[in-house]
Every structure is written in structure tokens, then in C-alpha cells.
């Protein structure tokens, strides 16, 4: 049902990385506009992206209020130029999104190796603690602030002259690994949340190798 020439949104999909969260849907509007509402399971509906012709809506500001809550969104369809018009049941046509729990479902963004420092046969590798849009006391929290020990990093490291990738893991943002003296190594890191069953891993960081700018060597 619904008003003439108005179609309900479909394929409502959450796209979220490091808590930056956008709801996307179809179809591209023809003679219609959309408004999005979001709420927690027990909360009131809040309207966003009023009467838009876009097929996406940035809901980051809402979900970062409590990333452990479960959210539901819905997309209303209105005839263009006649947004007061309602469907045959007396209210506008709308479609519900799947439920979304940011803490469990946001994708982990690609990490970055901040630095590495060699001292003798040890190398200290530091991963950048990426800032998120989650706020506490008016400051933005880092990924580590939000996830705590739930977040680990896997370091892949290998001699420049070989292909086998050794691994190390940490629940901080630092690794201290043993290396062979006189050998150059390359590094890549991956963020992982082992307690998850889906969206557990980030993509790999860019590879950084010894003998390049980010590193420092001391005897």
C-alpha cells in the first residue's frame, strides 16, 4: 500500500567503520523524498536527513551516544512536493532496517604503523591509536579507549629476503619482537576483536620496512 507513485525503500544496509555509521538504501528517488528515523530498542524515534533525495543518511551522531546499544532505523518515503501526503493506512510508507549494534558490528578500519625502533636484536613496533567519533567528556575517544582489551593487534613480520610471515599479538598498541641482527624486516598489522563472530578483522595496514623513513635504529 501507499500513495500513488511512492515506493518503499528497500535493501536498507548499515555501513560502519570505526563507528562512522551511514545507513544506505534503494531506490534512487523518482518524484519522492526520504526521511530517516532512528531509535534504540527502548527509546523514542529521532528524525534525521529530512526530506532528502539522497539514498544514505549519516547516523554517526546518534549511535556514538552509546555504541553498545542496539539501534533500529526506518526510512519513510514521501511524494516530492507533497510531504504531508500519507499512505492508505494514514501514515507514510516506510521500511525498517536490520538491527545494528555498533560495538559488535562496526568494521575495524585499516590500522597504521606509527613507528618502529630497533635496539640490538629487539624491535618495538607501535600502532597508531586511531581516533573515533565516540565522545566522552567532550573529547573524542580512540579505538583502544572504546574497545579496551577486546581489541588486539596482530603483527605480521618477515625478513625482507624471505616470504614466511611470523606473527605476534598484543592487547596494547605496542609489540616488542626478536629479530636477527643485520637483517631487514617488513611489518604489517591487523586489528582483531577475537570475541566477535563476524567483522573480526580489519584489512591489513600498509607494509612498512626497515631501512625506510618510519624506523629508527640504535645499537
Amino acid at each position: 500500500s501507499g500513495t500513488t507513485n511512492t515506493v518503499a525503500a528497500y535493501n536498507l544496509t548499515w555501513k560502519s567503520t570505526n563507528f562512522k555509521t551511514i545507513l544506505e538504501w534503494e531506490p534512487k528517488p523518482v518524484n519522492q523524498v526520504y526521511t530517516v528515523q532512528i531509535s534504540t530498542k527502548s527509546g523514542d524515534w529521532k528524525s534525521k536527513c529530512f526530506y532528502t533525495t539522497d539514498t544514505e543518511c549519516d547516523l554517526t551522531d546518534e549511535i556514538v551516544k552509546d555504541v553498545k546499544q542496539t539501534y533500529l532505523a526506518r526510512v519513510f518515503s514521501y511524494p516530492a512536493g507533497n510531504v504531508e501526503s500519507t499512505g492508505s493506512a494514514g501514515e507514510p510508507l516506510y521500511e525498517n532496517s536490520p538491527e545494528f549494534t555498533p560495538y559488535l558490528e562496526t568494521n575495524l578500519g585499516q590500522p597504521t604503523i606509527q613507528s618502529f625502533e630497533q635496539v640490538g636484536t629487539k624491535v618495538n613496533v607501535t600502532v597508531e591509536d586511531e581516533r573515533t567519533l565516540v565522545r566522552r567528556n567532550n573529547t573524542f575517544l580512540s579505538l583502544r579507549d572504546v574497545f579496551g582489551k577486546d581489541l588486539i593487534y596482530t603483527l605480521y613480520y618477515w625478513k625482507s629476503s624471505s616470504s614466511g610471515k611470523k606473527t605476534a599479538k598484543t592487547n596494547t598498541n605496542e609489540f616488542l619482537i626478536d629479530v636477527d641482527k643485520g637483517e631487514n624486516y617488513c611489518f604489517s598489522v591487523q586489528a582483531v576483536i577475537p570475541s566477535r563472530t563476524v567483522n573480526r578483522k580489519s584489512t591489513d595496514s600498509p607494509v612498512e620496512c626497515m631501512g625506510q623513513e618510519k624506523g629508527e635504529f640504535r645499537e
Epitope: 611470523k166 604489517s188 591487523q190 577475537p194 563472530t197 573480526r200
Partner: antibody
């Protein structure tokens, strides 16, 4: 339900080749690391190698380096162990196992194993 | 590579006995040690991870502890189904390595 099922074992002559498969269900292999572990008759467990299916990274035990290759097909949710230049000492039950990728990375699920016998 | 030296290689015990198996790492492995149980013809099963954490579904008579590079698996009161071979494993560095195994037999 999480399951790992190995297949492809059998009798092979020294110098021969064999490809083992590890079919996973109940989870996506690209979210985990997959290891191969073997056990010679009456002996202990020996780690063979691993693959991170999300990026193809691998590492092998010295005893198999250059002879064995681990690969994965994420569309089939399956990991493989290609064994070339087989020797009598490669005779063993071969298990695939899932690494939960926590800091201590235990192997939380194992397959039932498949027997490889290298003999003339 | 890190060596995991497990002892004893075998032991005989009776139902109800307290059993202790130890593993010594050749260098620091932090708490990255797991313990597995294996019965004849079967795959190993995870018992303990991170040195002292009981894996889901494992009976509470199993426990693990760490003192430096020494790791201990304790079965507080041996049950008939506990007669098996037990392995420690470190995964602090690649390659992960196993202890030689301890066979727990009926006295």
C-alpha cells in the same frame, strides 16, 4: 555449528604429491587463521604451518619448508595443504585447526584428521 | 624456536587422584600457553588457554597456572574419562610449539 573436515589423505610413494583439504563450516575462514598440525604414529603433535586466508600470509615449519604449500579459497571456505616431495617421515595424521586470534591464540576447533602414509 | 619441555612423559594414577603436569618454556612466552587433551584416534581438544583460563564446556576440575616460564595443568580429582594424553603449546611466537605430551594411564 563450527566444524572442520579434512580430506585427501591416502597412500603415496616417496617423492610423490598429495593435496589435503580442510572444509570449514559455521564460520568464515577469512575471519580466522588456519593451521595444519600433524601427528606421526605413536608420536606427539607437530605444527606444520598456517595461513591467514584474509591476506594469504603463510609460515611453515622448517621440516616442510619448500615442500609444502598452504593455500585457501575463501569462496569455498576451504584451506589446503599441498604436499610435494613426500618422505617416509611425513607419514602422519594431518589435522587442520582454527586459531581464535586472541593474544594467546589457542586452537579452539580441530578437524578429525586425515591419514597420510608415505611408503613404497 | 621456543622449546616446551613437558614432564612427566607418562604417569599412572587412580580415579580421584590429583594430577599435575608441568611444561617449561625455553624463553618468556608471557601467558600464551594452551593445554589440550587427546584420546586415541581423536583430535586434540582445547582445555585451557592463556595459561589459566578454562575453555567453554571444560569441567572445573581442570585448571592451569603460570609461574614465570613454568606452566602447570592440574586435574583436581581424576575421572575415568580423563585418561588420555595431554599437550601444552605456546603461541607467543611463530612457530607455535607443543610439549612432548604426557600420557595419563590407569594405575
Amino acid at each position: 555449528e563450527v566444524q572442520l573436515v579434512e580430506s585427501g589423505g591416502g597412500l603415496v610413494q616417496p617423492g610423490g604429491s598429495l593435496r589435503l583439504s580442510c572444509a570449514a563450516s559455521g564460520f568464515n575462514i577469512s575471519d580466522y587463521n588456519i593451521h595444519w598440525v600433524r601427528q606421526a604414529p605413536g608420536k606427539g603433535l607437530e605444527w606444520v604451518g598456517y595461513i591467514d586466508p584474509s591476506n594469504g600470509y603463510t609460515y611453515y615449519a622448517d621440516s616442510v619448508k619448500g615442500r609444502f604449500t598452504i593455500s585457501a579459497d575463501t569462496s569455498k571456505n576451504t584451506a589446503y595443504l599441498q604436499m610435494n616431495s613426500l618422505r617416509a617421515e611425513d607419514t602422519a595424521v594431518y589435522y587442520c585447526a582454527r586459531d581464535d586470534q586472541s593474544v594467546s591464540s589457542p586452537f579452539d576447533y580441530w578437524g578429525q584428521g586425515t591419514l597420510v602414509t608415505v611408503s613404497s | 624456536d621456543i622449546q616446551m619441555t613437558q614432564s612427566p612423559s607418562s604417569l599412572s594414577a587412580s580415579v580421584g587422584d590429583r594430577v599435575t603436569i608441568t611444561c617449561r618454556a625455553s624463553q618468556d612466552v608471557n601467558t600464551a600457553v594452551a593445554w589440550y587433551q587427546q584420546k586415541p584416534g581423536k583430535a586434540p581438544k582445547l582445555l585451557i588457554y592463556s595459561a589459566s583460563f578454562l575453555y567453554s564446556g571444560v569441567p572445573s576440575r581442570f585448571s592451569g597456572s603460570r609461574s614465570g616460564t613454568d606452566f602447570t595443568l592440574t586435574i583436581s580429582s581424576l575421572q575415568p574419562e580423563d585418561f588420555a594424553t595431554y599437550y601444552c603449546q605456546q603461541h607467543y611466537t611463530t612457530p607455535p610449539t607443543f610439549g612432548q605430551g604426557t600420557k595419563v594411564e590407569i594405575k
